[in-house]
């Protein structure tokens, strides 16, 4: 794809996107702002103790389509939302944890006394 005044486009996006980052800030971020050629994201997931943890940041163009597709992972409650419409758009993303399924309460084989 050709960009205005350029021989070849460096990426699918003509310009860098700035995102809020929290718990997921790369070394090149400044003041909790990262930059990307892909997407901003906000994700909620349970940690090992079952506490919901929210992280946000930047996803590079490579592989971001897959990462932004909220495919369920067995035995892991998490949800991710992505955006590109403006800088720091992920400030306004509020993903929620998927509801618990009955089997999520089961931690292994059930033993009866």
């Amino acid at each position: 794809k050709k960009e205005d005044g350029e021989s070849t486009a460096p990426t699918a996006r003509p310009k860098v996107l700035r995102c809020k980052c929290h718990h997921h800030c790369p070394e090149d971020s400044v003041n909790n702002i990262c930059s990307t050629d892909g997407y901003c994201f906000t994700m909620i997931e349970e940690d090992d103790s079952g506490t919901p943890v929210v992280t946000s940041g930047c996803l590079g163009l490579e592989g971001s389509d897959f990462q932004c597709r909220d495919t369920p992972i067995p035995h892991q409650r998490r949800s991710i939302e992505c955006c590109t419409e403006r800088n720091e758009c992920n400030k306004d993303l509020h993903p929620t944890l998927p509801p618990l399924k009955d089997r999520d309460f089961v931690d292994g084989p059930i033993h009866h006394k």
Partner: antibody
Framework: QVQLQQPGAELVKPGASVKLSCKAS????????MQWVKQRPGQGLEWIGE????????LYNQKFKDKATLTVDTSSSTAYMQLSSLTSEDSAVYYC?????????WGQGTTLTVSS | DAVMTQSPLSLPVSLGDQASISCRSS???????????LHWYLQKPGQSPKLLIY???NRFSGVPDRFSGSGSGTDFTLKISRVEAEDLGVYFC?????????FGSGTKLEIK
Amino acid sequence: QVQLQQPGAELVKPGASVKLSCKASGYTFTNYWMQWVKQRPGQGLEWIGEIDPSDRYTLYNQKFKDKATLTVDTSSSTAYMQLSSLTSEDSAVYYCARFGYYVDYWGQGTTLTVSS
Amino acid sequence: DAVMTQSPLSLPVSLGDQASISCRSSQSLVHSTGNTYLHWYLQKPGQSPKLLIYKVSNRFSGVPDRFSGSGSGTDFTLKISRVEAEDLGVYFCSQTTHVPFTFGSGTKLEIK
């Protein structure tokens, strides 16, 4: 073709403010950031900051945070930089430049002279 | 801030010679996306800078193939295979990986 038009020169008094302009043409104004760069003779190039015309989001070099204010008028595809409390240290050539992931086009620059 | 150190400051050459300019960064310019945002510009007297090379080694449209860029991490090089009169001026490297974006101090290419 991509063009960034800047006035050739501005003369202002110490302590005053000035608003430099940069009129863009030949591309979709909101598709690229606009950066501003300072060049003083023998002192190289300094990045002042940038603005995304699509949402007016700004990013500044901390060194210029209290000196420069970046704005845009999307209806006329024009970027502005206001410089305040001017001193002789602000005398320089100021360039606007189109930025995607790198600067590919520069304006011709405005020579700012601060003198009483 | 990423400090960009260029060498030499002045490079006297004869027309037709090869010229090589070095640019070193105080920190790696590999961005978290995997891209390396190191670029080269030429500024002729009384003019604004013009883009030659973007992202280390990509020639910008209209730039002759005698210009080439190479390097990785913190060390980068601009080579001009056969210097022509129109190549004379000041060459700057620039990084847009880390905010604030920074420039090298410039290398003046002049006739020997």
